[in-house]
Amino acid sequence: FQTFEGDLKWHHHNITYWIQNYSEDLPRAVIDDAFARAFALWSAVTPLTFTRVYSRDADIVIQFGVAEHGDGYPFDGKDGLLAHAFPPGPGIQGDAHFDDDELWSLGKGVVVPTRFGNADGAACHFPFIFEGRSYSACTTDGRSDGLPWCSTTANYDTDDRFGFCPSERLYTQDGNADGKPCQFPFIFQGQSYSACTTDGRSDGYRWCATTANYDRDKLFGFCPTRADSTVMGGNSAGELCVFPFTFLGKEYSTCTSEGRGDGRLWCATTSNFDSDKKWGFCPDQGYSLFLVAAHEFGHALGLDHSSVPEALMYPMYRFTEGPPLHKDDVNGIRHLYGPRPEPEPRPPTTTTPQPTAPPTVCPTGPPTVHPSERPTAGPTGPPSAGPTGPPTAGPSTATTVPLSPVDDACNVNIFDAIAEIGNQLYLFKDGKYWRFSEGRGSRPQGPFLIADKWPALPRKLDSVFEERLSKKLFFFSGRQVWVYTGASVLGPRRLDKLGLGADVAQVTGALRSGRGKMLLFSGRRLWRFDVKAQMVDPRSASEVDRMFPGVPLDTHDVFQYREKAYFCQDRFYWRVSSRSELNQVDQVGYVTYDILQCPED
């Protein structure tokens, strides 16, 4: 084993960690569990304990990112560098970053949890044998109802264990139809659809109607994603395999390496490769998040690489199902922290432990039996509203900070950022925010802590906006942007990723500009921004005073409220209304007195 120069280590034993964001490759519960198990390897042999927290002052901050992701060590796309970690210390020291251009799994292919069947929700086992053939993705073979299923062991023929894969024919998510499956074909805006669609949405989410006519019934749900058959590379990256598909006149109902000399599995993304030539690579075994995390956490605790090839801290990834820690790893970590203390002898307990609840029984039966139950669904909203997302990571009621005069929004001279979110005005300042609903005698509520509702964010924000269709929240601070969908966060990402050059130091505001489009402001300049593509059109760059004559040129925040544009400078705002394509200043006022209706005392 090797330790870092000067035996860098944590000087306390109760280590905290924060999972800042997630990969889409695995269910969140699986990611949480992989990290917890990885920490448990190290706590089992040392006096260290690991506690999950939900704030950035955790010792170890865990983040998924791609390419340039906010430190000086960019990731390199798929394969190669899988993750990296910093040695113990304050700030970014001790943090662990995982390359989200990898396929994260548990080392044996994509993790696809099943429903119903007879496997108690176990994940698919890829590849699996059915009727003597090998399958590397869910299949509809053996069924007449088109429901995709998989075996949860290596051999369905011998073990008979199966479950149904995520499928819109089985259930939908969120939406307003209680999780009912899609109804195909269905009518939307007078047109007939026989598959999930993104039509009518600007955020790329696939949805369907759960009755034959959306126009009449307005019932819909979002289609589950199928990690097992989402292709990479080829000419259809991100699309789904279509089974069966025709290749050189022959039908394939699973991924194949036919026609390739390198043995890599591929599939067509339409039913006929011969005519459409659309294809991509099928997911590979992926990298075990558990094993890679265990290795990275070794670095985060102070271990350098080992020269022992069997050790977890050896610098090459190797999938193993055995105990990951080698004696060399144990010796190394104990060199830094000592062994785990022997537990105190304890008298036998006299209370009878409560039995855990029995597992709920899923409908059973072989793959030819249609499941008899339907899952329940999440929050509602029309197709244009987007998935509302799970609750925020913080407390269920936002923490109110003890009040002092500066905590009264009416005493704030200049807010960092203001945004209309939902039907309320949110006002941000120094790690806090207030909410305001217009009405006679209403006052701003708060302050609340930004970190409780949006834990990934910095204290100081430059601007915030909500994209109404997808309910995505964009938070800008300096050269970085965070995008929240419910409680899940993408970021921080650099402004370069939005197509804004290095000369753009910050985004000072945003206004809606048509369906799925925004105007982004930075000082005297503005750009048209496509929310779905998350990219500005570089050719759209314009001077603010050309489009909005009469507003100050040194505004520090631009926001939209009640369909009007507000340009803030110092304590004042310039309100702009649009009439027949003309933008005209129709009011100048104080943010506190005129918008928040603060008393003028």
Epitope: G72, P74, G80, L81, A83, H84, A85, G89, E296, D304
Partner: antibody, heavy 124, light 107 residues
């Protein structure tokens, strides 16, 4: 003893091309990221490009993007920089440098070994 | 990109004196800072990495300190061979950037 030896510099006309090489010895070349850093006459240091240990990832300074290509041959312990569409402002001493950090352990920021440099002059 | 500003541009001191060179980053870079020494006609030489760790073979009179945005290179007692140009370099954020250099000359 770690050694880095650059070659391939010289006088070239604007729009021309040159290929620089850097022969490495004394360390496990295939484990480390390698960099090209340049220094215009009488000026400071400017990073040009980096290639990760496996050669699977390359990054470039904005000033050379699209014109320069970094590559490596781990079997020959050699780093390369192919320079096309050269401009007068590319005139500099070009150094290859070894990263102190390696693989997934990040920290130990710094370039612990440098070559002696090779002069590239772009002039008509 | 993060701007690295070194001061002073030139420092004139006599042998035996203490030299203090400053490097300031335009935003926090944690401790991801290195110092290099460059003599005329030679390649740069790593002195300090991660703000405060002396590189192999560097005399104990060289020390580095600081974190976040403000960093210092100190030479406790100048030797004749220490007169050179000194550069700081950050890797707290991508891309890496160098300071413009401080020339240390004999008074």
């Amino acid at each position: 003893e770690v050694q880095l030896l650059e070659s391939g510099g010289g006088l070239v006309q604007p729009g021309g091309s040159l290929r620089l090489s850097c022969a490495a010895s004394g360390f496990t070349f295939s484990q480390y990221s390698m960099w090209w850093v340049r220094q215009a006459p009488g000026k400071g240091l400017e990073w040009v490009s980096v290639i990760y240990s496996s050669g699977g990832a390359t990054f470039y300074a904005d000033s050379v993007k699209g014109r320069f290509t970094i590559s490596r041959d781990n079997s020959k312990n050699t780093l390369y920089l192919q320079m096309n569409s050269l401009r007068a402002e590319d005139t500099a001493v070009y150094y290859c440098a070894k990263d102190r950090a390696y693989g997934d352990y990040v920290g130990w920021n710094g370039f612990d070994y440098w070559g002696q440099g090779t002069l590239v002059t772009v002039s008509s | 990109d993060i701007q690295m500003t070194q001061s002073p541009a030139t420092l004139s001191l006599s042998p035996g004196e203490r030299a203090t060179l400053s490097c300031r980053a335009s935003q926090s870079i944690s401790s991801f800072l290195a110092w290099y020494q460059q003599k005329p006609g030679q390649a740069p030489r790593l002195l300090i990495y991660d703000a405060s760790y002396r590189a192999t073979g560097i005399p104990a009179r060289f020390s580095g300190s600081g974190s976040g945005t403000d960093f210092t290179l100190t030479i406790s007692s100048l030797e004749p061979e220490d007169y050179a140009v000194y550069y700081c370099q950050q890797r707290g954020n991508w891309p890496i950037t160098f300071g413009q250099g401080t020339r240390l000359e004999i008074k």
